[in-house]
C-alpha cells in the first residue's frame, strides 16, 4: 500500500475514562495534526478508519463495531463506548485515507476503575479559586456531546464521598457548583455524577475537579525579603564558615515566576572566584504563598571575602527587591577596609 503519514503515538493525549461509563473520543488528527476538519475530509472522499492495539500486545487489530447493543460505535470523527470495559485499555489509531492519501495517529486510552468514593488512578483537573473572593463557579467538565440539549440530566455533586447538601458556602446548581467567599477548608475533590437516559438505558458520567483555594490578587505584593536584614550582622574570623540565608516571601500570584538570586560585588556567584555553595529550599502556605530560601555559604572565609558586598535579590510579576547582608571581620570595628 501507499506510504502513510504516521504521526506516531500521541502521548500528549493520555486519555483516561472510567470503567462502565460512556466515553466519546475524538480522532486527534483533526484537532492537532491536520489543517482541515472531518467534514471537509469526508466531503473530499477521505475515509476515517479506526483500529487498536490491546494493552501488552503488539498486534494491531480492527475495532469490533458489531458488539451487542452497539457498545462501540463510530459517529463522524468520534469513537463511542457505551459503556467502556476495563479491557478496552490500549493504544487506539485513527487513520484518514483514500487511494492516494493516508494520515494516521495513535493515542493511549486507559480505562480506570473507581471505588464508591470516586477514588481512582484518574488525574483530575485543578481549579484554583481566590480566597474570600465573592463567588466562584466550577462547571462539571467534559460532558458536552454526550446527550442532546433536549435531555435534562440529573446532576449530583459530592465533596470527597459526601453529597453536597446544606453546605453553608457551597451551592449545587445543576452542572455548576458555586462557592461563596471560599476558604481553605473548601480545598478538596469535587465530583459531579451526571445521569442521563439513552435508548431506554441510564448512563452515568463521573467527573472530578480538585479545588485549591489560593491567595487573592488584592493581596499580591512584590517580594518581601525577611533575611538578610539590617538587624543581623554576620561577624566572622578568617577561616570560619560564612553562612547567609536569603529568605524571601512571595504572595501567591497566578502564573508568576518567582526568582531569588545572590550577587557578590555585583556579580553572579558563578562569575566570581570565591568558592561558594548555594542551596535553595521552598515552602508553601495553605494558600500557596511561597517562601524561598537560598543559603549562601563559604566554607573557609578569607579577609577579602569579608570585605565583599553580598546582596540578595528577588523578583516576581509585581516587582523586585534587594537587600545587602551586613558582613564584617571579627574584631574589626568597621565593615569597610580603612584607606589612609
Amino acid at each position: 500500500s501507499e506510504r502513510c503519514d504516521d504521526w506516531g503515538l500521541d502521548t500528549m493525549r493520555q486519555i483516561q475514562v472510567f470503567e462502565d461509563e460512556p466515553a466519546r473520543i475524538k480522532c486527534p488528527l483533526f484537532e492537532h495534526f491536520l489543517k482541515y476538519n472531518y467534514s471537509t475530509a469526508h466531503s473530499s472522499g477521505l475515509t476515517l478508519i479506526w483500529y487498536w492495539t490491546r494493552q501488552d500486545r503488539d498486534l494491531e487489530e480492527p475495532i469490533n463495531f458489531r458488539l451487542p447493543e452497539n457498545r462501540i460505535s463510530k459517529e463522524k470523527d468520534v469513537l463511542w463506548f457505551r459503556p467502556t470495559l476495563l479491557n478496552d485499555t490500549g493504544n487506539y489509531t485513527c487513520m484518514l485515507r483514500n487511494t492516494t492519501y493516508c494520515s494516521k495517529v495513535a493515542f493511549p486510552l486507559e480505562v480506570v476503575q473507581k471505588d464508591s468514593c470516586f477514588n481512582s488512578a484518574m488525574r483530575f483537573p485543578v481549579h484554583k479559586m481566590y480566597i474570600e473572593h465573592g463567588i466562584h463557579k466550577i462547571t462539571c467538565p467534559n460532558v458536552d456531546g454526550y446527550f442532546p440539549s433536549s435531555v435534562k440530566p440529573s446532576v449530583t455533586w459530592y465533596k470527597g464521598c459526601t453529597e453536597i447538601v446544606d453546605f453553608h458556602n457551597v451551592l449545587p446548581e445543576g452542572m455548576n457548583l458555586s462557592f461563596f467567599i471560599p476558604l481553605v477548608s473548601n480545598n478538596g475533590n469535587y465530583t459531579c455524577v451526571v445521569t442521563y437516559p439513552e435508548n431506554g438505558r441510564l448512563f452515568h458520567l463521573t467527573r472530578t475537579v480538585t479545588v485549591k483555594v489560593v491567595g487573592s490578587p488584592k493581596d499580591a505584593l512584590p517580594p518581601q525579603i525577611y533575611s538578610p536584614n539590617d538587624r543581623v550582622v554576620y561577624e566572622k574570623e578568617p577561616g570560619e564558615e560564612l553562612v547567609i540565608p536569603c529568605k524571601v516571601y512571595f504572595s501567591f500570584i497566578m502564573d508568576s515566576h518567582n526568582e531569588v538570586w545572590w550577587t557578590i560585588d555585583g556579580k553572579k556567584p558563578d562569575d566570581v572566584t570565591v568558592d561558594i555553595t548555594i542551596n535553595e529550599s521552598v515552602s508553601y502556605s495553605s494558600t500557596e504563598d511561597e517562601t524561598r530560601t537560598q543559603i549562601l555559604s563559604i566554607k573557609k572565609v578569607t579577609p577579602e571575602d569579608l570585605r565583599r558586598n553580598y546582596v540578595c535579590h528577588a523578583r516576581n510579576t509585581k516587582g523586585e527587591a534587594e537587600q545587602a547582608a551586613k558582613v564584617k571581620q571579627k574584631g574589626n570595628g568597621c565593615t569597610e577596609p580603612m584607606t589612609l
Epitope: 465573592g134 463567588i135 481553605v184 477548608s185 487573592s216
Partner: antibody, heavy 118, light 107 residues
C-alpha cells in the same frame, strides 16, 4: 487608625424593618470582607452575615436567611444590613466587624442596639 | 455547623495568678481559631488568631495554643484589666461560630 461606626438601630415592632449602616475608615475598605455579628442582652456572640470584599458573595446564618440582606458600597466605605420581618429574638446589639481568613474579626465597631418589641 | 464549647463557664482567679481557658471544637478547625476579650458595654477585642498568634498591641501575658479540636488561652499573670468575658471562635468553615464564653472574675 481603623474605625467602624454603626448606626440605624432603634425600637421596631415585630414584622417591621430596619436598615443598619457601618461607616468604615482608616483602611482600604474594598480589600476586606465585612460581617455583622450580634449579641442578645446577656448572651454570647452570634455571627449573622458576611460579604466578600468585592460585594458579590454573601452568606447568612440560618436564623436570618431570607429576612436579612447584607450589602456594601465600596465607593462610600459603608456596609449595610437590611433587616425585614423582624422578630423578638432579633433583639441584640449588632456589631460590624472586618474580617480576613488569616486574622478572623480583627476590628469591631462599638455596636448599635436593635430592640424588637410591641 | 461546627459547635464550639468553652470551659469553664466562670473562672474565679486572684490578680497575679494564672488563668487557663479551654475551647473545644466539634470537628477539626486546623489552627483557624481566634480568642476575643469583651468587657461590659464594650465591643469584643481580638486577642489571638491562628490559635497562637497575638494580635497587634496585645500584651505577652496572653498566649494561645492548640490545633485541631482542642485549644487553650492562657493569661500568665492576671491584671485588673483582664477581668472580662473571653470567647473563642473558629473561622475554618462557614458559618463562623463562637463559643458561649468564659467569664473570668476576681476571686
Amino acid at each position: 487608625e481603623v474605625q467602624l461606626l454603626e448606626s440605624g438601630g432603634g425600637l421596631v415592632q415585630p414584622g417591621g424593618s430596619l436598615r443598619l449602616s457601618c461607616a468604615a475608615s482608616g483602611f482600604t475598605f474594598s480589600h476586606y470582607g465585612m460581617s455583622w455579628v450580634r449579641q442578645a442582652p446577656g448572651k454570647g456572640l452570634e455571627w449573622v452575615s458576611a460579604i466578600s470584599y468585592d460585594g458579590e458573595g454573601t452568606l447568612y446564618a440560618d436564623s436570618v436567611k431570607g429576612r436579612f440582606t447584607i450589602s456594601r458600597d465600596n465607593s462610600k466605605n459603608t456596609l449595610y444590613l437590611q433587616m425585614n420581618s423582624l422578630r423578638a429574638e432579633d433583639t441584640a446589639v449588632y456589631y460590624c466587624a472586618r474580617f480576613r481568613y488569616y486574622t478572623a474579626f480583627d476590628y469591631w465597631g462599638q455596636g448599635t442596639l436593635v430592640t424588637v418589641s410591641s | 455547623e461546627i459547635v464550639m464549647t468553652q470551659s469553664p463557664a466562670t473562672l474565679s482567679v486572684s490578680p497575679g495568678e494564672r488563668a487557663t481557658l479551654s475551647c473545644r471544637a466539634s470537628q477539626s478547625v486546623s489552627s483557624n481559631l481566634a480568642w476575643y476579650q469583651q468587657k461590659p458595654g464594650q465591643a469584643p477585642r481580638l486577642l489571638i488568631y491562628g490559635a497562637s498568634t497575638r494580635a497587634t498591641g496585645i500584651p505577652a501575658r496572653f498566649s494561645g495554643s492548640g490545633s485541631g479540636t482542642e485549644f487553650t488561652l492562657t493569661i500568665s499573670s492576671l491584671q485588673s484589666e483582664d477581668f472580662a468575658v473571653y470567647y473563642c471562635q473558629q473561622y475554618n468553615n462557614w458559618p463562623w461560630t463562637f463559643g458561649q464564653g468564659t467569664k473570668v472574675e476576681i476571686k
